[in-house]
């Protein structure tokens, strides 16, 4: 039961995380105009990965897409790439994990196959989360650098009365959404990897001795406990004897020192 719960929770957490990564990637508020210690403007600027927007105090909002690829900063391109890779990996991970869910029966899919798929999706979620966190962090670092650069020459002018106010940008809502979403996807991935360990069938049939019925010959296949990674063939690990009614999750429990005869 614990494995199913861990896997299910990992899937749900990753799903929320990936939805958040998609939302963050699409959001326009990656950087927003810094209003602190600035003259009160009737115009509010904010920028996303794909377009920049201006909201006037009149309520009118105008957004313009970045209709160039070569003219954009390399860092912005890198952030875009990281976020897209994160989304793609996350989406594939979700697809794989749906089939890996213990509560979903697909033909005669064995536990070993589900374990492999669970681990695969878990790794994908971890990488997806790391991509999102990296992308958001790179953008945040870029903002911090630009912020202090523009603070250094906040008022640039030709001397005298005429002044130009430099627009400074600070962290937008999308950054926080991205960090949280990336973290959730990462946590979900770790949970899937943990669940995979519980799903993997053991080579040791330590259950054989538990309920020995008298008069029956019981085959016992020796072999030390092998911690399964989820990869590799486990098709030979067939159950020889199970003398009692157990839940699926109980069968997957790890051997203790009492299980070895």
């Amino acid at each position: 039961m614990a494995v199913t719960a861990c896997q299910g929770l990992g899937f749900v957490v990753s799903l929320i995380g990936i939805a958040g990564i998609i939302a963050a990637t699409c959001m326009d508020q990656w950087s927003t105009q810094d209003l602190y210690n600035n003259p009160v403007t009737a115009v509010f600027n904010y920028q996303g990965l794909w377009r920049s927007c201006v909201r006037e105090s009149s309520g009118f909002t105008e957004c313009r897409g970045y209709f160039t690829l070569l003219g954009l900063p390399a860092m912005l391109q890198a952030v875009r790439a990281l976020m897209i890779v994160g989304i793609v990996l996350g989406a594939i991970g979700l697809l794989v994990s749906i089939f890996a869910l213990k509560c979903i029966r697909i033909g005669s899919m064995e536990d070993s196959a589900k374990a492999n798929m669970t681990l695969t999706s878990g790794i994908m979620f971890i990488v997806s989360g790391l991509c999102a966190i990296a992308g958001v962090s790179v953008f945040a670092n870029m903002l911090v650098t630009n912020f202090w650069m523009s603070t250094a020459n906040m008022y640039t002018g030709m001397g005298g009365m005429v002044q130009t106010v430099q627009t400074r940008y600070t962290f937008g809502a999308a950054l926080f959404v991205g960090w949280v979403a990336g973290g959730l996807t990462l946590i979900g991935g770790v949970m899937m990897c943990i669940a995979c360990r519980g799903l993997a069938p053991e080579e040791t049939n330590y259950k054989a001795v538990s309920y020995h019925a008298s008069g029956h010959s019981v085959a016992y296949k020796p072999g030390g406990f092998k911690a399964s990674t989820g990869f590799g063939s486990n098709t030979k690990n067939k159950k020889i004897y199970d003398g009692g009614a157990r839940t699926e999750d109980e069968v997957q429990s790890y051997p203790s020192k009492h299980d070895y005869v």
């Epitope: 105009q33 003259p39 009160v40 403007t41 009737a42 115009v43 600027n45 920028q47 920049s52 927007c53 201006v54 006037e56 105090s57 009149s58 309520g59 009118f60 105008e62 313009r64 005429v162 002044q163 130009t164 106010v165 627009t167």
Partner: antibody, heavy 118, light 113 residues
Framework: EVQLVESGGGLVKPGGSLRLSCAAS????????VSWVRQAPGKGLEWVST????????YYADSVKGRFTISRDNAKNSLYLQMNSLRAEDTAVYYC???????????WGQGTSVTVSS | DIVMTQSPSSLSVSPGERVTISCKSS????????????LTWYQQKPGQPPKLLIY???TRESGVPDRFSGSGSGTDFTLTISSFQAEDVAVYYC?????????FGAGTKLELK
Amino acid sequence: EVQLVESGGGLVKPGGSLRLSCAASGFTFSNSAVSWVRQAPGKGLEWVSTITSGVSYTYYADSVKGRFTISRDNAKNSLYLQMNSLRAEDTAVYYCTRQFKGNALDYWGQGTSVTVSS
Amino acid sequence: DIVMTQSPSSLSVSPGERVTISCKSSQSLLNSGNQKNYLTWYQQKPGQPPKLLIYWASTRESGVPDRFSGSGSGTDFTLTISSFQAEDVAVYYCQNDYFYPLTFGAGTKLELK
């Protein structure tokens, strides 16, 4: 057709109070930022206050800050200007206006006259 | 506060004449986010409320005759009437629409010569 109709002007003694109202029609009032602009007799235009749509941020000219309060009632499509501690220099025609693209004031009412005199 | 300086303060013009009114702001009204200048021009005829002519420094309001045009960027702006008509007799105001308080220029009075 967009219409802005001001009311509530009149003669008031220095230190007195007055509440101006503006009834709006012909546009989605709740989605628009609206302002008050005044014009003293024979003088130029002076922006007084603005209230934005949505969260209703309010902005005031330094000359009226702390004395005037702008407010709106979206249900009634109405804009208000509560004027307290009135001074002789507040004597003017007060216009109710709607903010448009570029924060420009595209529609103006006919104005209501406020006279502050003892 | 942003100071808007208009010149000339008054002008006598003959019909058909080209008119230029200057407006200077103490700070740049150019917004880097959309590369637009937040300067507006109004026309006020005697006994009437002001009328919007031009916003974003050069965008003509619908219904405004094309003889009116706005230009300039940053701190220096110009309103041009390509061919002055008798009905253009009015006071013209520029306004800073970028910084609060939204300050107006003192106005330029155009009279018929």
